[in-house]
């Protein structure tokens, strides 16, 4: 009989090589039985994982598994780093392995972010 615990299927030591400027979806595969758990993404900063509050996320449901997706529209150079998803289930916090994004910046360092980037990430203006 399969366990009815929530399970987060991010591979240990997984990595993604992506290009700045491209859209990218980072998936957290989630297995659950009855009620879908509350899932969040965070980005590792040293030993702490900083919750990503104001980022676009969505769910994709498939037959045997669901995916909690963190959207990068577009990918920015400072999206480089390690991410983890976490699920709250029956007062327990379940954490995934971390997954690392390696962002290649295809633009020259002197070029400013585009209007589209500013529109999709307005908080860039206030950093």
């Amino acid at each position: 009989k399969e366990s009815c615990d929530v399970q987060l299927y991010i591979k240990r030591q997984s990595e993604h090589s992506i290009l700045a400027g491209d859209p990218f979806e980072l998936e957290c595969p989630v297995k659950y039985c009855a009620n879908r758990p509350h899932v969040t993404w965070c980005k590792l900063n040293g030993t702490t994982c900083v919750k990503l509050e104001d980022r676009q996320t969505s769910w994709k449901e498939e037959k045997n598994i669901s995916f909690f997706i963190l959207h990068f529209e577009p990918v920015l150079p400072n999206d480089n780093g390690s991410y983890r998803c976490s699920a709250n289930f029956q007062s327990n916090l379940i954490e995934s392995h971390s997954t690392t994004l390696y962002v290649t910046d295809v633009k020259s360092a002197s070029e400013r972010p585009s209007k589209d980037e500013m529109a999709s990430r307005p908080w860039l203006l206030y950093r």
């Epitope: 240990r12 997984s14 990595e15």
Partner: antibody
């Protein structure tokens, strides 16, 4: 039942290239890493590298990077090891092994492929 | 890279006798997730390696409980209490904490 079926023995000339295959049955290779391990005659085991078939991302032992290339075809549930510029040092048995979600760590192994590099 | 050093190189035992193999790593194998990715494999003559133990001490399915794994940090031990004929072969430790992953040099278990 999980099985890893490797391609047959190869005899190749020095300087040539060869591509070995490892077909996985019993689960989707997207859910695993596939590793390749080398064993020279009467020697120990050497980790060559691994691939994440879900996105094609690879890791290699730096000593072997450049001569070994690992790829995967998720439609056929098969991983490949390509070895180029072969020398007698590449004469060995090559094993593939799986690693479910990166946590099971070489739990299933193929039967091995014997590669002989000789003129 | 992490160097895995196994001792002894060869271990000659009488069937029924106990055996112990040591594996030392050049740095701690404790990962940031709190787990230690240290496995033991047995390669019988003419066969593929078979995993016996993972995460230092977790016995794999179908492996007899005469095998026990112990250790932490950099020092690990595989013990066989009462060696049987099917246990003969070469034993390898392996670390999966750091890239590149590395095997120990192997310990050949043979009969006297």
């Amino acid at each position: 039942e999980v099985q890893l079926q490797q391609s047959g023995a190869e005899l190749v000339r020095p300087g040539a290239s060869v591509k070995l295959s490892c077909t996985v049955s019993g689960f989707n290779i997207k859910d695993t890493y596939v590793h390749w391990v080398k064993q020279r005659p009467e020697q120990g085991l050497e980790w060559i590298g691994r691939i994440d078939p879900a996105n094609g991302h690879t890791k290699y032992d730096p000593k072997l990077q450049g001569t070994a290339t690992i790829t995967a075809d998720t439609s056929s549930n098969t991983a490949y090891l390509q070895l180029s510029s072969l020398t007698s040092e590449d004469t060995a048995v090559y094993y593939c092994a799986t690693d479910y979600y990166g946590s099971s760590l070489l739990d299933y192994w193929g039967q091995g492929t014997t590669l002989t590099v000789s003129s | 890279e992490v160097v895995m050093t196994q001792t002894p190189l060869t271990l000659s035992v009488t069937i029924g006798q106990s055996a112990s193999i040591s594996c030392k790593s050049s740095q701690s194998l404790l990962d940031s997730d709190g787990k230690t990715y240290l496995n033991w494999f047995l390669q019988r003559p003419g066969q593929s390696p078979k995993r016996l133990m993972h995460l230092v001490s977790k016995l794999d399915s179908g492996v007899p409980d005469r095998f026990t794994g112990s250790g932490s940090g950099t020092d690990f031990t595989l013990k066989i209490s009462g060696v049987e004929a099917e246990d003969l072969g070469v034993y390898y430790c392996w670390q999966g904490t750091y890239f590149p992953y590395t095997f120990g040099g192997g310990t050949k278990l043979e009969t006297k």
